[in-house]
Every structure is written in C-alpha cells, then in structure tokens.
C-alpha cells in the first residue's frame, strides 16, 4: 500500500482556486526526491502538470505552483482560475509517475450558481443555523409574511406568519418579525440539512404590491481535515462545534459503508469495543469544544471520522459536524512492541515503552487507563522519581535500555493489575503507546522468602532461588526506592535445592546486609536481566527491629515469615510467581508470553483513586506484612 496520502475528492467552482496537500513519510530520501502532480489519462499513464523540479505544463502556466515542506513531510499544489476543463482524475506522488508512490485525487469543478438579480447568498455549514433577512415596506407591515423554497418550477411554502410550518422544517424553524421601528422580518433555520440548500423567496403581502426578496442557501458539507499518523502511534481529534451546542451530547464516529457512522465514543458513555483501552475523551471547553485521543493506531483505524453534537450521542441529520480523513502510515517510525503482555499472579512484568529517541531527556510516564468517565488515565509512576502511593515497592520506571525505549517493571501482580496501560512522555505526543497486561495461571520462576525481619546492628542474609532456565542471565539484588532500584552486592551460593526438576545450573544468590541500620528497612528485589533488558523480579520486604539477642540472621525460605495471604509450600518456601513479560528477544526459549496481537478483551484493573494519589515517597509501609 502506498504511504502517500491526500484528499480523495476536491470540489470547487469555476474561477476559484484550490490548495491540495499531499503527505509522505518524511525520510531523508523522500524529503529530497521529486514531487509531482499529474493528470490520469483514459488509457492509463499520468501526464505531469507540475513538479518540484521546476516543470510547469502550458495548461498550468501562470496559475499553479507546487511547494515542498520537507520538515512536515508534505507538499502543496495550488491551482488558480479553475475551469470545468480541470475536472478529472489526478495523482500526487513522489519519484517517477509510474512507480506507484502516489495517491489518487478526484477534482470536480462545477459551474457557479446562476443567480437572479438582487439574490442574497447564504453559505452555512451543515448542522448550523442560518438567519434569512427579509425587508418589506410600511404598507405591508400588517400583511402576511412568508418564506417559499423553489422546488423545480414551483415555490413551496416553508413558513408563514399565520403559524404554518412545512413538515420538513418542524421543530427547527421560526419566523421573527422585528419591532415596529425595523421593516424587516427574519426566518431562522437550525440544524441545517444538505436538503435545505436551494433558492428561497421571502414575501411580505400577497398581492401585486407585495415585497419580495430572493435568497440562495448553500449548505456546506465539511471538507475533511487530512490527518497522517504512524502505525502504533496516536492521534488527537480536536472538535470545536461552537457554544450553541455546549450542552448537547457529543460524539466521535467512524464512517462505514454509505452514510452509516459507527460511534467510536460519546459523552453518554458509549465506547466501541475496538477502542477499549486506547481512547480518552477529554472534557469539553466552555465553548463546547472537546478532544478525543486514540493510541495504538492500527491499519483498520484509517478512515473518515466525524465529530458532532446530538442529544442521542450519534450522527443524525442536522447534527453540526467536523470531519477528518485519517491515514495510518504503515512505514512507521514507532517500533513494534508487544501490545499484550502476560504475567502470573504474584510475579512481575517488564514492559518496554518506545519514545522518540530525539527526546531522550523528556520525562517518561506510565498510567493506567480507566474506562470510567469516557476514559481517563491516572499516572502511576514517572521518571522524575514519583510513584503513586499504592504502588510503592512494586513499581519502577527505568530509563534503560535507552535510545528510544524505557522499561517499566511491576511486580507482586494481582488480578487487579489486569488492564490497559499507556506509555507517555512530555515530548512528542504522537508516541503515546498502549499495552494490555493480562494475568494468567502459572507457576513461579523465582523463589524468595516472605517478608523478613532484620535486627539492628546484626547481619542479614536473604536468599533468592533462580531455576536453571536462567543460567545464562545476570542475576541481581537491588533496593527499591521511588527513583528506581539501586543495585546491591550479592553472593552466588551455588546450586539451589529449591527446584525438583532442575540440574546444577539452578542458582541460589543471596543478599547480605551487614550491620543492619534503620535505613536498611524497605523493599528489596531480586531479578534477572541481560544487558539493559530486564526479566522477572521478586520482591521481599525487610523490616528492622531492635536487638533481642546477639548473633546474625541467615534467613532461609522456611524460616521467613509468610504473609497470611501467601502460599507456603511443604518445603517452607514462599512462592513469588514470576511467569512472564520479558522482552521477546531476551526470553526466546520460553513459551510466547509477549503476545503482539491486538486484543481488547481481559478484565479491568481497579486501582483506587482517592485523595492519597499524589503521595509518593518510600517511607510509608503500613500496607505491608511485617
């Protein structure tokens, strides 16, 4: 499929001008290659009319130009003094005309309306309001006022001052007669339809002395704004419908076959399943405008979108609307990353988040999409060292591996963590991406003790058992804080005896805290990684208490305090289940746990969003067992 995009249809009137914008992926090759506008012939082929290399056909001499905007990835063709001869099928493209790197554009130039003398022209957008003003003389002040529409050869009464309203205009038309000082009456038509367009006649009086005024009403279907976005990226539709519909339900819909427009989201709480987890409807401004953000763009998201206002929350005749034509560029600069990531309850996930590598200094964020209130996304962690209070000890955002990717690790997973998460930065908003976390059944990989109590001044040794499948991985211990997880020295104690079907390649790696102080209290993680790519983690909370008896503590799995809601095996081990979510390049030998298919099912996560949500920090551990 060609990555070139432009308007499918361009309509204009004789004598007018058009400006046609064509989009292309802004690679260095594309930015500098030839741009052209050509007319398609009946037998195929495409005859160049103008190009970026300076060629202008004699047909366009003095009335057309082509301008390239390489920084935007667009070029614009302006054509003036249009005639009906300009109607036809064209292509805008890059390179050689026959190469296929092009987009088909249909140009329709129509004859201007043949208007009667003294005709007032009203040009109004679909769904809006028009006021047709009708002057009259004093002698007709007390006589009947009326508005007719010319249908074919005959005028058809639309409204009059005696109370008649044509059924086609019921509920959306009124006739106002100004105060005695002004010799004027006006007809106001709301929620304009395309079928309202045409010639109208105002009349005051019914005899030969009546006053008449011609009006031509042109109802404009909104020209779609072209939107060119990358696959896997995001788009924002800003919808400004005007203050007159500020209190009317708003919607965004996508046109399917014919005139059908399927609701994507509306302010009445409806949301299309295909957009679950990747859409936010932002509240409207006081002028009635609102915006819709869609992330994780897919090929099938391409198409025509309309936003509008109607009490039903969907497109109806007479809805004021705005239109966009979305093109999803498959030659995306946004790298592929898993859209579904799976983790076992009690285990961890490591999610890779792409960002624009030109913005390495940008602040990184991770938020949890909530379906309530038309979609919203409370932040959970950022790269400035803030972590939402409920996530202390189990969530970390790491700048690694860098160069266009950061990592988010979430451990101690529960079913409540299932849901959609967004990767964000304060830089390029097109790089918002979405990942769904699913909680699955499974067994743990890493084994650590339950929460541990250390004694002030003594030595504490905490074990972490790694199965043989991780023999080639770097094993580490670190201390969690709200800026990350600081690596600590650890000792390889040789093969682990915690695994039944595991050979000498299993490992027991211990963390030793010498001369424990109050500062040692907190969360500790053991985990595996390869270079800057993180795999599974398991978390242990270490509490510190006053000395009771001398000596050091060597915490075995059996001796560790198991929390009440934790499973203690016959062997005395507390299992931290850690199946999943690694970078697929890293954990190729495991079953495919990073599922890159787009899926929109799965249960929602429900995270409290009370007033404590700003309180980060790493000193409160009231919610832990110790």
């Amino acid at each position: 499929k060609s990555p070139i995009f432009g308007p499918e249809e361009v309509n204009s009137v004789e004598g007018n001008s058009v400006s046609i914008t064509c989009y292309y992926p802004p690679t260095s090759v594309n930015r500098h290659t030839r741009k052209y506008w050509c007319r398609q012939g009946a037998r195929g082929g495409c005859i160049t009319l103008i190009s970026s290399e300076g060629y202008v056909s004699s047909k366009y001499a003095g009335r057309a130009n082509l301008t390239n905007f390489p920084e935007n990835g667009t070029f614009v063709v302006n054509i003036a003094q249009l005639s009906q001869d300009d109607s036809g099928r064209y292509k805008c493209g890059l390179g050689i005309n026959s190469r296929g790197l092009s987009f088909d554009v249909s140009l329709e130039v129509s004859q201007g309306p043949g208007l009667l003398n003294d005709t007032k022209v009203y040009t109004v957008d679909l769904g809006r309001t028009v006021t047709i003003n009708c002057p009259f003389k004093t002698e007709n002040a007390q006589k009947r006022k009326s508005l007719y529409k010319q249908i074919g050869l005959y005028p058809v009464l639309v409204i009059d001052s005696s109370g008649y309203v044509n059924p086609n205009y019921t509920g959306r038309i009124r006739l106002d007669i100004q105060g005695t000082g002004q010799l004027l009456f006006s007809v106001v038509i709301n929620q304009l339809r395309l079928s309202d367009a045409g010639q109208y006649l105002c009349q005051a009086g019914d005899d030969s002395n009546s006053n008449k005024k011609n009006a031509d009403l042109q109802v404009l279907k909104p020209e779609p704004e072209l939107v060119y976005e990358d696959l896997r990226g995001s788009v924002t539709f800003h919808c400004a419908l005007g203050p007159e519909v500020a209190n009317v339900a708003k919607f965004l819909c996508r046109q399917s076959s014919g005139e059908n427009c399927d609701v994507v989201v509306n302010t009445l709480g409806k949301r299309a399943p295909a957009f679950e987890g990747r859409i936010l409807l932002n509240p409207q401004d006081k002028d009635g405008s609102f915006s819709v953000v869609i992330t994780g763009l897919r090929k099938e998201d391409a198409g025509r979108y309309l936003c509008g206002a109607h009490s039903d929350g969907q497109l109806q005749e007479g809805s004021p609307i705005q239109a966009w034509q979305l093109f999803v560029n498959e030659e995306s600069t946004i790298p592929r990353s898993p859209t579904v990531v799976k983790g076992v309850a009690g285990s961890s996930v490591a999610v890779l988040c792409p960002y624009n590598r030109k913005e390495s200094k940008s602040i990184k964020y991770w938020c949890l999409w909530e379906g309530a209130q038309n979609g919203r996304c409370p932040l959970l962690v950022d790269s400035e060292g803030w972590v939402k209070a409920q996530y202390e000890g189990r969530l970390s955002l790491l700048e690694e591996p860098g160069n266009g990717t950061f990592t988010v690790i979430l451990n101690q997973l529960t079913s409540r963590d299932a849901g959609f998460y967004w990767c964000l930065t304060n830089g390029d908003t097109l790089w918002r991406t979405t990942v769904e976390i699913k909680i699955i059944e499974g067994e743990p990989n890493l084994k650590v003790p339950g929460n541990v109590t250390a004694v002030l001044g003594e030595t504490l040794k905490v074990p972490c058992h790694f199965p043989c499948k991780f023999s080639s991985y770097e094993k580490y211990w670190c201390k969690w804080n709200n800026t990350g997880c600081q690596a600590l020295p650890s000792q390889d104690e040789g093969p682990s005896k915690a695994f039944v079907n595991c050979d000498e390649n299993s490992r027991l790696v211990s963390l030793t805290l010498n001369l424990v102080t109050r500062a040692d209290e907190g969360w500790y993680w053991c985990g595996v990684k390869q270079g800057h790519f993180y795999g599974e983690t398991a978390a242990v909370y270490v509490a510190v208490e006053e000395r009771k008896a001398a000596g050091s503590r060597d915490v075995s799995l059996a001796k560790a305090d198991a929390a009440p809601d934790e499973k203690v095996l016959d062997s005395g081990f507390r299992e931290i289940e850690n199946k999943a979510i690694q970078d697929p390049r890293l954990f190729a030998e495991e079953k495919a746990v990073a599922d890159t298919r787009d899926q929109a099912d799965g249960s929602r996560a429900s995270v409290d969003s009370g007033s404590s949500e700003e309180q980060g920090g790493s000193s409160r551990h009231h919610h832990h067992h110790h």
Partner: nanobody, 124 residues
C-alpha cells in the same frame, strides 16, 4: 510530591479583574490535571475551573463561565486563573490543586495536591 503556592489575591472592586498564579515545585506539572477551587466563609469548598495536561481542554463551574479563564505554562511550571467582571459573591479563599491524571475526565475528589490558598475579596 508536587508543592503548590498561590499568589495574586487581594481586594478588588466589583467589575474589576485579578490574575491568580499557582507556582509548582517538587516535580513538573506536565502530567497533572490542574484546577482551581474556592471556599467562601461558612461554605464548602467548590470547584471553579480545571485544565488538562496540555492546556487544550478546560472546564468551568457555571457560575464563572465566560468570566474566568484558566491557563497553564508547563515550561514555567505555573497555572493561572484570570478573573474578570468580578462579583461580590466571588469573594473566597482560592486554592490551586493538582491531580496526577494524564488526561480524561477528572472528578473533584481526584485532586490530591493542594496549595495553602490566596484570599480574594470583591467589594461592592
């Protein structure tokens, strides 16, 4: 955690204008929905206006629509409330608040960071 400090309050005559500022420190406010609330003597704290992370979406209480404008400058880590055509009933302590929501609808109870407030008095 973000710390918020309001300024710009004072005494003004009915029909006059004031511009309140809310300076944030501790972390950048980009990822925050920011809001203004007010509390008149003997009354509950009420919502005045809110603005999303990018500044593209705002929302106002009916009582201030068309008179007050909320804006933000993420580079300066500051939020503003421009108050025009002030009325005596606008007299209150005005509080700046922040909510760590990237986007979307945010209810009043979702605001978790608060400033100390600045007094606005409108005389008739």
């Amino acid at each position: 955690q973000v710390q918020l400090v309001e300024s710009g309050g004072g005494l003004v005559q009915a029909g006059g204008s004031l511009r309140l500022s809310c300076a944030a420190s501790g972390r950048t406010i980009y990822g925050y929905v920011m809001g203004w609330f007010r509390q008149a003597p003997g009354k509950e704290r009420e919502f005045v206006a809110r603005i999303d992370w990018s500044g593209s979406s705002t929302d106002y209480a009916d009582s201030v629509k068309g008179r007050f404008t909320i804006s933000r400058d993420n580079a300066k880590n500051t939020v503003y409330l421009q108050m025009n055509s002030l009325k005596p009933e606008d007299t209150a302590v005005y509080y700046c608040a922040g909510s760590a929501y990237y986007s979307g609808y945010v209810t009043h109870r979702d605001f978790g960071s608060w400033g100390q407030g600045t007094q606005v008095t409108v005389s008739s």
